[in-house]
């Protein structure tokens, strides 16, 4: 298997996932497409952690571009006899992948906390509150309680959808970076490609 090609595949995937993370996080600032709640600071505290913009987004672009840069047309050297620089690059990509793991891990943790706590909303008493914070995430299973939030409109659906998307995207990014750690270690130790005859796209 060509480790460089696999790294490039992972890199391209991470770029797409990072952009989706950034988009999902930005949407969290505009419940129901409205700007007033951000300006009034009536958003969940976990929205302000920038988990999708920084953790699953910008921080993910660094390893993504490192991985993309690894694969070249002349990628095949064998078992350490040639392309020592590329083997070093593969090993250094492990460091980039670890940065990616940290970013995606941060995204996953914050998204999970945001889901568990629920949104900040105007509750049935007319108070801006974390209405579902005490339910330990059980509100996710009982949609009949979601009407306890009177404002913003559909805020529970909005928060649950977008934090779930961030959780899923961050999880995929985490797995891809983990794969690249393994890929990078194998590529660095075994050689950039194992033979001229066998090349596989991942």
């Amino acid at each position: 298997m060509c480790y460089g090609k696999c790294a490039r595949c992972i890199g391209h995937s991470l770029v797409g996932l990072a952009l989706l993370c950034i988009a999902a996080n930005i949407l969290l600032y505009f419940p129901n497409g409205e700007t007033k709640y951000a300006s009034e600071n009536h958003l969940s505290r976990f929205v302000w952690f920038f988990s999708g913009i920084v953790g699953g987004g910008l921080l993910m672009l660094l390893p993504a571009f490192v991985f993309i840069g690894l694969e070249q047309d002349d990628c095949c050297g064998c078992c350490g006899h040639e392309n020592c620089g590329k083997r070093c690059a593969m090993l250094s990509s492990v460091l980039a992948a670890l940065i990616g793991i940290a970013g995606s891990g941060y995204c996953v943790i914050v998204a999970a906390l945001g889901l568990a706590e629920g949104p900040l909303c105007l509750d049935s008493l007319g108070q801006w509150n974390y209405t579902f914070a005490s339910t330990e995430g059980q509100y996710l299973l009982d949609t009949s309680t979601w009407s306890e939030c009177t404002e913003p409109k559909h805020i529970v659906e909005w928060n649950v959808s977008l934090f779930s998307i961030l959780l899923a995207l961050g999880g995929i990014e985490f797995i891809l970076c983990l794969i690249q750690v393994i890929n990078g270690v194998l590529g660095g130790i075994c050689g950039f490609c194992c033979s001229h005859q066998q090349q596989y796209d991942c």
Epitope: L122, L125, E151
Partner: antibody, heavy 120, light 106 residues
């Protein structure tokens, strides 16, 4: 001047429905909720529920759930309260009240009240 | 449901006297509001958040208390103060009112 003006008195038969209107003026309608409170003759005050005028989401008191519907028309700054399946003990003065959101939540502006009499 | 019990049910006093109205909850609450109602009129907000004077309300009205016991005090009764007074809690749904205290002229 901030005020809430309610529709006139109504006389209804048991089993019928009544719809009371409440027109707001002198303030931004969607910045405050509207609560509905009723008072039976010679009795105390009873909270029926409230509506978020910005989103249109209502919250009903358990005793009235399934029998009451609260709506708003933001174009005319008017709130409505419809009570169905009327009984004789629904005879009361119905008030709409401006509701201030926040840590201190209070009813600072009251309508003049609408007397609903349920009698066969 | 939080039940508010007001006492006394009726308070007979003369103008110029001090009136002390009590409101007791069956469980602890954060704040209460006080309203005044005169015959044939809608209630009027007097005190919000236990101790804050509503706009346009004279300084002779004051509120205090915490937990389960709350008090409305009228330092010196004026003729226009003879009315029914209600306390109201907003700590949990349903929002509830006390049964009222009627302040009448002695």
């Amino acid at each position: 001047e901030v005020q809430l003006v309610q529709s006139g008195a109504e006389v209804k038969k048991p089993g019928a429905s009544v719809k009371v209107s409440c027109k707001a003026s002198g303030y931004t309608f969607t910045n405050y909720g509207v609560k509905w409170v009723r008072q039976a003759p010679g009795q105390g005050l009873e909270w029926m529920g409230w509506i978020n005028t910005y989103t249109g989401n209502p919250i009903y008191a358990a005793d009235f759930k399934g029998r009451v519907t609260m709506t708003t028309d933001t174009s005319t700054s008017t709130a409505y309260m419809e009570l169905r399946s009327l009984r004789s003990d629904d005879t009361a003065v119905y008030y709409c009240v401006r509701f201030q959101y926040g840590d201190y939540r209070y009813f600072d502006v009251w309508g003049q009240g609408t007397l609903v009499t349920v009698s066969s | 449901e939080i039940v508010l019990t007001q006492s006394p049910a009726t308070l007979s006093l003369s103008p110029g006297e001090r009136a002390t109205l009590s409101c007791r909850a069956n469980s602890g609450i954060s704040f209460i509001n006080w309203y005044q109602q005169k015959p044939g009129q809608a209630p009027r907000l007097l005190i919000y958040g236990t101790a804050n004077l509503a706009s346009g309300i004279p300084a002779r009205f004051s509120g205090s208390g915490s937990g389960r016991d709350f008090t409305l005090t009228i330092s010196s009764l004026e003729p226009e103060d003879f009315a029914v007074y209600y306390c109201q809690q907003y700590s949990s749904n349903p929002l509830t009112f006390g049964g009222g205290t009627k302040v009448e002229i002695k």
